[in-house]
C-alpha cells in the first residue's frame, strides 16, 4: 500500500434526543476496482474497543450492541460506512470508533452527545397561604426527565438574578434522565414575581416557570 485508508467522521459531536435514532457518519475513499469483499469495517466503543457492529468477509455481521445498530448496506460500496443507532439511550453517550480495513487500515472516532429536553417547571410555595410582606418562603421549581444536567437560574420580576439562598439538586432516574429541584428561600416584598429558568446546556433549550405573589391571594400563571 502507498498510504493508509483515510477514514473521515464529523469533528463535532452528533447530538441525539433520547428515544430517537442517530446516524454516526463515517466515510472512506474506495480505490478504483474496490469491492465489498475487500472491506472489513468495525464499529466499536472507543474507550474499550468493544465491538458494536461489523462488516467482514463480504457481509454484514450484524449488531453486537443490543441489536440497535445498522449499517447502510446500499451505500457501503461508495465508501459510506455510517452507523445507525436506534432508540438512543443516555447510556449510549460517548465516543464510537469507525475502523476500516481494506489493503491497509485506519480509524476515526465520533462522539455521540445524548440529550433530552426538560419539562416545563412546576412551582410550589411553602407556606402557601396567609403570606405577608416580610415572611420567608421557599419556592420550589421542579423540572423532569432531562439530560444532561441542567443549569438553573432564578430572577425576580425586574429580571434581577437571584443567586443567594438557592439550593439545587439533580437526581438521575434509572434511565439516566435527571429530575431537577431548585429551592429559593426569599423574604417577600409587598408583591413580586419569581421566575426559574431550567436550561439544557446541550440543546440550549430553556424551560420557564414563575410564580407571582400579590399579598393575598397569590396567583400562579396559567400553564403555557
Amino acid at each position: 500500500p502507498t498510504g493508509a485508508v483515510e477514514v473521515q467522521v464529523p469533528e463535532d459531536p452528533v447530538v441525539a434526543l433520547v428515544g430517537t435514532d442517530a446516524t454516526l457518519r463515517c466515510s472512506f475513499s474506495p480505490e478504483p476496482g474496490f469491492s465489498l469483499a475487500q472491506l472489513n469495517l468495525i464499529w466499536q466503543l472507543t474507550d474499550t474497543k468493544q465491538l458494536v457492529h461489523s462488516f467482514t468477509e463480504g457481509r454484514d455481521q450484524g449488531s453486537a450492541y443490543a441489536n440497535r445498530t445498522a449499517l447502510f448496506p446500499d451505500l457501503l460500496a461508495q465508501g459510506n460506512a455510517s452507523l445507525r443507532l436506534q432508540r438512543v439511550r443516555v447510556a449510549d453517550e460517548g465516543s464510537f470508533t469507525c475502523f476500516v480495513s481494506i489493503r491497509d487500515f485506519g480509524s476515526a472516532a465520533v462522539s455521540l452527545q445524548v440529550a433530552a429536553p426538560y419539562s416545563k417547571p412546576s412551582m410550589t410555595l411553602e407556606p402557601n397561604k396567609d403570606l405577608r410582606p416580610g415572611d420567608t418562603v421557599t419556592i420550589t421549581c421542579s423540572s423532569y426527565r432531562g439530560y444532561p444536567e441542567a443549569e438553573v437560574f432564578w430572577q425576580d420580576g425586574q429580571g434581577v438574578p437571584l443567586t443567594g439562598n438557592v439550593t439545587t439538586s439533580q437526581m438521575a432516574n434509572e434511565q439516566g434522565l435527571f429530575d431537577v429541584h431548585s429551592v429559593l428561600r426569599v423574604v417577600l416584598g409587598a408583591n413580586g414575581t419569581y421566575s426559574c429558568l431550567v436550561r439544557n446546556p446541550v440543546l440550549q433549550q430553556d424551560a420557564h416557570g414563575s410564580v407571582t405573589i400579590t399579598g393575598q391571594p397569590m396567583t400562579f400563571p396559567p400553564e403555557a
Epitope: A4, E6, N40, D47, K49, Q50, A108, A109
Partner: antibody, heavy 124, light 109 residues
Framework: QVQLVQSGAEVKKPGSSVKVSCKAS????????INWVRQAPGQGLEWMGG????????NYAQKFQGRVTITADESTSTAYMELSSLRSDDTAVYYC?????????????????WGQGTTVTVSS | DIQMTQEPSLTTSPGGTVTLTCRSS?????????ANWVQEKPGQAPRGLIG???KRAPGTPARFSGSLIGGKAALTITGVQPEDEAIYFC?????????FGGGTKLEIK
C-alpha cells in the same frame, strides 16, 4: 499466556535485506494487529508498521515506505518484517508487539505483549 | 510530522508518587489516541504497562495508572518502588499509525 517469539540475531551487509519473524506461542493472532517497532542503540522506540493478520491489511510508517514489507501467515501465527536496502543506521533491535483490534474481553490492553527482540547489525 | 514530548528525566524517592506526561503536537490527547505506556529496563525487552489510556495490562501492578490530564496522556506511579527505575515511553495512535514519545528516564533516589 501468549508469548511472541522472534527469530535470532542477524548480521547483514549494507544494501542487503533482512527478514525477521515473530511467532505467537500459546495463542493466535485472532483479533490482533502485530506492530513492528525498532530501537537503535541509545535511541527511543520507533514504529515501523503493522499488520492485521486476519485481514492481511498493512500500514507502514512513511519513513520506511517502500523499504519495509510486513506479512503474516495466520496458519502458523507468524508475522514477518523484511527490511531492504539496509544501511548502517538500520542497526537496531527490532521488536514485534501485538495490539488488540477488537477487545473481545471488553478491555483494551493495548500493546501488552512484546517479543524478546531481534538484533540486526548492518556492517560492511 | 507528529511530535510527542515527554519529560527527558524525572527523579523520585521510594514510596513517593510521580506523574509522567506525554504531549502531542497535534493538540489535546483523547481516548481515540489509545495512549499506551511502555516500560523498558536495560537489557530487557519493552513491557506494555498501560493500554487504551487507562487499562492496566495483565501483570501490571496497581501502583501504575494511566489517565488524561490537561490534554496530555499521563502515567502516575503511586508508591514508587526501586524496581520502577526504567525508561517509560508513551505511544499514541493517530488514525493509521503509532507514534512513540522520546521516553522519560525515571530515577529512584
Amino acid at each position: 499466556q501468549v508469548q511472541l517469539v522472534q527469530s535470532g540475531a542477524e548480521v547483514k551487509k549494507p544494501g542487503s535485506s533482512v527478514k525477521v519473524s515473530c511467532k505467537a506461542s500459546g495463542g493466535t493472532f485472532s483479533n490482533y494487529a502485530i506492530n513492528w517497532v525498532r530501537q537503535a542503540p541509545g535511541q527511543g522506540l520507533e514504529w515501523m508498521g503493522g499488520i492485521i493478520p486476519m485481514w492481511q491489511s498493512v500500514n507502514y510508517a512513511q519513513k520506511f515506505q517502500g523499504r519495509v514489507t510486513i506479512t503474516a501467515d495466520e496458519s502458523t501465527s507468524t508475522a514477518y518484517m523484511e527490511l531492504s536496502s539496509l544501511r548502517s543506521d538500520d542497526t537496531a533491535v527490532y521488536y514485534c508487539a501485538r495490539d488488540q483490534v477488537v477487545a473481545t474481553s471488553g478491555v483494551n490492553f493495548g500493546m501488552d505483549v512484546w517479543g524478546q527482540g531481534t538484533t540486526v547489525t548492518v556492517s560492511s | 510530522d507528529i511530535q510527542m514530548t515527554q519529560e527527558p528525566s524525572l527523579t523520585t524517592s521510594p514510596g513517593g508518587t510521580v506523574t509522567l506526561t506525554c504531549r502531542s503536537s497535534t493538540g489535546a490527547v483523547t481516548t481515540s489516541n489509545y495512549a499506551n505506556w511502555v516500560q523498558e529496563k536495560p537489557g530487557q525487552a519493552p513491557r506494555g504497562l498501560i493500554g487504551g489510556t487507562n487499562k492496566r495490562a495483565p501483570g501490571t501492578p496497581a501502583r501504575f495508572s494511566g489517565s488524561l490530564i490537561g490534554g496530555k496522556a499521563a502515567l502516575t506511579i503511586t508508591g514508587v518502588q526501586p524496581e520502577d527505575e526504567a525508561i517509560y515511553f508513551c505511544a499514541l495512535w493517530y488514525s493509521n499509525l503509532w507514534v512513540f514519545g522520546g521516553g522519560t528516564k525515571l530515577e529512584i533516589k
